[in-house]
């Protein structure tokens, strides 16, 4: 079943999705829609990439990690509660059926209303990357990857402020990610 | 005018061999993924293979692609299957059809097909 | 593989008739639902896919719903045009599978 991510209305929703390049800039399309993946591509399109550039996106959809190391994470900006729903996150490996499909729940909270602003950790400011915790076939790995200045204390400390969101699973087992080559 | 245009179809011996062609006109081929369904006489559709638009990804009924392989000439215009040791239960029409595409769609359905090709494979 | 069963096999039904045609798919399969018309020596044309977004030029008295596992193919008044093989095709696993067809004939 879909791994599923949390957001308020009015933040930015973050829908993490990674590939590892067989080799530096050798990039692999992908594509992300709105809707479980079909058999091929992805329905109701809302970004696409190619060997080179992103060739198709649509309003409020953007890649905020770099996409040419294979960081192909989703970020919706400023979500409604219409954009809850499954996203499909598809890696078009070449070759015979080698596609790899990632189909990602987001769940749409109301904003919550408070009487006076407080301190809120926003996760995607504090913690762009996911970890990259499961690899594909036989190149299983389990790294960390490319993370901002953070040690085990705050990864910890920012899993406990979002248990609520189920991203702290994630943390520990991200299924959108797969190693090529 | 979209034309999807098959031939190569015939009368092969079980573990022959045959090339079928499609010959696309009327529509930038290089943009749309491109499939092979195929119908048994008197019986229903059955798809076959499929290939992305640059031909780099390539799909198939897991029973025939050992035997079967789909490709593409963007340059030519043209849909290729090369058939490989025949079987009897081949035999049917075999059609060539684009995939539905426009930007934000997925090319899962298909809005075009071609005439058939019969393929009969007899002793 | 997923499981496309139509029904009914065949149908008789007279112009001016409204018809349903069911589909059924063996897991969900969401809204990844098509539907063909295929006359006798023709090919295959397309007539409603996601379900339920018609083909374009495909006459207002067809129409398409449902989602999930449950799906259905209407001709609200029948043509003599009308009278062909239907079949529908999931596109949410591989492979790609069709539903054994529904004949529709004139009564």
């Known amino acids: 079943s879909e791994v599923e991510y949390r957001a308020e209305v009015g933040q930015n929703a973050y829908l993490p999705c990674f590939y590892t390049p067989a080799a530096p800039g050798n990039l692999v399309p992908v594509c992300w829609g709105k809707g479980a993946c079909p058999v091929f591509e992805c329905g109701n399109v809302v970004l696409r990439t190619d060997e080179r550039d992103v060739n198709y996106w649509t309003s409020r959809y953007w890649l905020n990690g770099d996409f040419r190391k294979g960081d192909v994470s989703l970020t919706i900006e400023n979500v409604t509660l219409a954009d809850s729903g499954i996203y499909c996150c598809r890696i078009q490996i070449p070759g015979i059926m080698n596609d790899e499909k990632f189909n990602l729940k987001l769940v749409i909270k109301p904003a919550k209303v408070t009487p006076a602003p407080t301190r809120q950790r926003d996760f995607t400011a504090a913690f762009p990357r996911m970890l990259t915790t499961r690899g594909h076939g036989p190149a299983e790995t389990q790294t960390l990857g490319s993370l901002p200045d953070i040690n085990l204390t705050q990864i910890s400390t920012l899993a406990n402020e979002l248990r609520d969101s189920r991203l702290a699973n994630d943390l520990r087992d991200s299924g959108a990610t797969i190693r090529i080559g | 005018e979209v034309q999807l245009v098959e031939s190569g179809g015939g009368l092969v011996k079980p573990g022959g061999s045959l090339r079928l062609s499609c010959a696309a006109s009327?529509?930038?081929?290089?943009?749309?993924?491109m499939t092979w369904v195929r119908q048994a006489p008197g019986k229903g559709l059955e798809w076959v293979s499929s290939?992305?638009?640059?031909?780099?990804?390539?799909y198939y009924l897991d029973s025939l692609k050992s035997r079967f392989t789909i490709s593409r000439d963007n340059a030519k215009n043209s849909l290729y299957l090369q058939m490989n040791s025949l079987r009897a239960e081949d035999t049917a029409v075999y059609y060539c059809?684009?995939?539905?595409?426009?930007?934000?769609?997925?090319?899962?359905?298909?809005?075009?097909w071609g005439q058939g090709t019969l393929v009969t494979v007899s002793s | 593989d997923i499981q496309m069963t139509q029904s009914p096999s065949s149908l008789s039904a007279s112009v001016g008739d409204r018809v349903t045609i069911t589909c059924r798919a063996s897991?969900?399969?969401?809204?990844?639902l098509t539907w063909y018309q295929q006359k006798p020596g023709k090919s295959p044309k397309l007539l409603v896919y996601?379900?339920?977004t018609l083909a374009e030029g495909v006459p207002s008295r067809f129409s398409g719903s449902g989602s999930g596992t449950q799906f259905s193919l209407t001709i609200s008044s029948l043509q003599p045009e009308d009278f062909a093989n239907y079949y529908c095709?999931?596109?949410?696993?591989?492979?790609?599978?069709f539903g054994q067809g529904t004949k529709l004939e004139i009564k």
């Open positions: 290939i992305n638009y640059d031909g780099r990804n390539t």
């Open positions: 996601n379900a339920k």
């Open positions: 095709q999931q596109h949410y696993g591989t492979p790609l599978t």
């Open positions: 897991e969900n399969i969401y809204s990844y």
């Open positions: 009327g529509f930038t081929f290089s943009d749309y993924y």
């Open positions: 059809a684009r995939g539905y595409y426009y930007y934000g769609s997925s090319p899962n359905y298909f809005d075009y």
